[in-house]
């Protein structure tokens, strides 16, 4: 049954140059798990989880995006271009497709706190 | 506009195993959002879910089936196949194959079928 | 499995007629209920989803309404068209079943 929440860091920030662990995760549901999709604020793909061929970066985010933990991804090397919406789209079977949203700001200041908590958006 | 095409033997002897494709056109069967199922139907009645494939080969079966059904894919033919094994007389059916896509969160539906084929199990 | 119960299994109307099909499940499926129409030969067609939406295409005088264990197929004003077997189908539980279908004819 379609009962599932994705919880997401929520809103967080982080220092330019330094790096940021974006998580999601599914709860209250016994669907499979078949991928997870996560997309950059313009819809670009930056990186896939799928349950049968593992992981895949795109070409364009090799450098400076890593997989894990789990099924979250961590950037790193951050710019101020990086900040805005993230999504992370978990495909399941039999419930079909659930989505989460992050929002990043990537700050110039180098007391940038990296705050990060769970949240149902 | 998607099409979806079933092809193999229509005459399968009892204890043998029933193979068919269906072959997906008109669209990729590699796309993340959808899952590829068969159905079949007995002549003269209801409809009955076999399983689905996902492009990237896992599976969901029905338990009814689950002994002796393996549902594979083909990302390359853009096509996914059905296994059935040791078949009696109760397997002659109409075997249709169909996308499975969600609207918006409202779970996946049947929304793409083939035209479906029938397979006779006979001596 | 869920047991999807449908009645009556044939119904006899006139063009005009408003007709109703009615779908029971074995228990709860929230909304997750779908109904399909199927022509003699031909592959069964996506009418309404999660209960009550209307696919793409389908004329508005087909609605779906229920929720839970029991739920309805309403077609407003029948059709020469709409002379078919309808079966209802849960997809909120694993194995994905149907009902055994209603066939409307003709009176």
């Known amino acids: 049954m379609m009962t599932g929440t994705i919880e997401t860091t929520g809103n967080i920030s982080a220092k330019k140059g330094g790096s940021v662990i974006l998580q999601c995760h599914l709860s209250s549901t016994m669907a499979q798990v078949t991928q997870v999709n996560w997309e950059q604020h313009d819809h670009s793909l930056l990186a896939i989880r799928n349950a049968e061929l593992g992981w895949h970066i795109y070409p364009a985010f090799k450098d400076r995006v890593a997989p894990g933990p789990g099924l979250g991804l961590t950037l790193q090397s951050l710019t101020m271009n990086d900040t805005g919406e993230y999504f992370c789209t978990y495909h399941t079977y039999p419930d079909g497709t659930y989505r989460g949203r992050i929002f990043l700001e990537v700050l110039e200041s180098s007391v940038a706190e990296h705050s990060a908590r769970f949240q149902i958006p | 506009q998607l099409q979806l095409q079933e092809s193999g033997p229509g005459l399968v002897k009892p204890s043998e195993t029933l193979s068919l494709t269906c072959t997906v056109s008109?669209?990729?069967?590699?796309?993340?959002?959808?899952?590829w199922g068969w159905i079949r139907q007995p002549p003269g009645k209801g409809l009955e879910w076999i399983g689905s494939?996902?492009?990237?080969?896992?599976?969901f079966y029905n338990p009814s089936f689950k002994s002796r059904v393996t549902i594979s894919v083909d990302t390359s033919k853009n096509q996914f196949s059905l296994k059935l094994s040791s078949v009696t007389a109760a397997d002659t059916a109409v075997y249709y194959c169909?996308?499975?896509?969600?609207?918006?969160?409202?779970?996946?539906?049947?929304?793409?079928w083939g035209q479906g084929t029938l397979v006779t199990v006979s001596s | 499995d869920i047991q999807m119960t449908q009645s009556p299994s044939t119904l006899s109307a006139s063009v005009g007629d408003r007709v109703t099909i009615t779908c029971r499940a074995s228990q709860s499926i929230s909304s997750w209920l779908a109904w399909y129409q199927q022509k003699p030969g031909k592959a069964p067609k996506l009418l309404i989803y999660k209960a009550s939406s209307l696919e793409s295409g389908v004329p508005s005088r087909f609605s779906g309404s229920g929720s839970g264990t029991e739920f309805t197929l309403t077609i407003s004003s029948l059709q020469p068209d709409d002379f078919a077997t309808y079966y209802c189908q849960q997809y909120g539980i694993l194995p994905r079943t149907f009902g055994g279908g209603t066939k409307v004819e003709i009176k």
């Open positions: 008109g669209g990729s069967i590699s796309s993340s959002l959808y899952y």
């Open positions: 169909a996308r499975e896509a969600g609207r918006g969160t409202t779970g996946l539906l049947f929304d793409y």
């Open positions: 494939i996902y492009y990237s080969g896992s599976t």
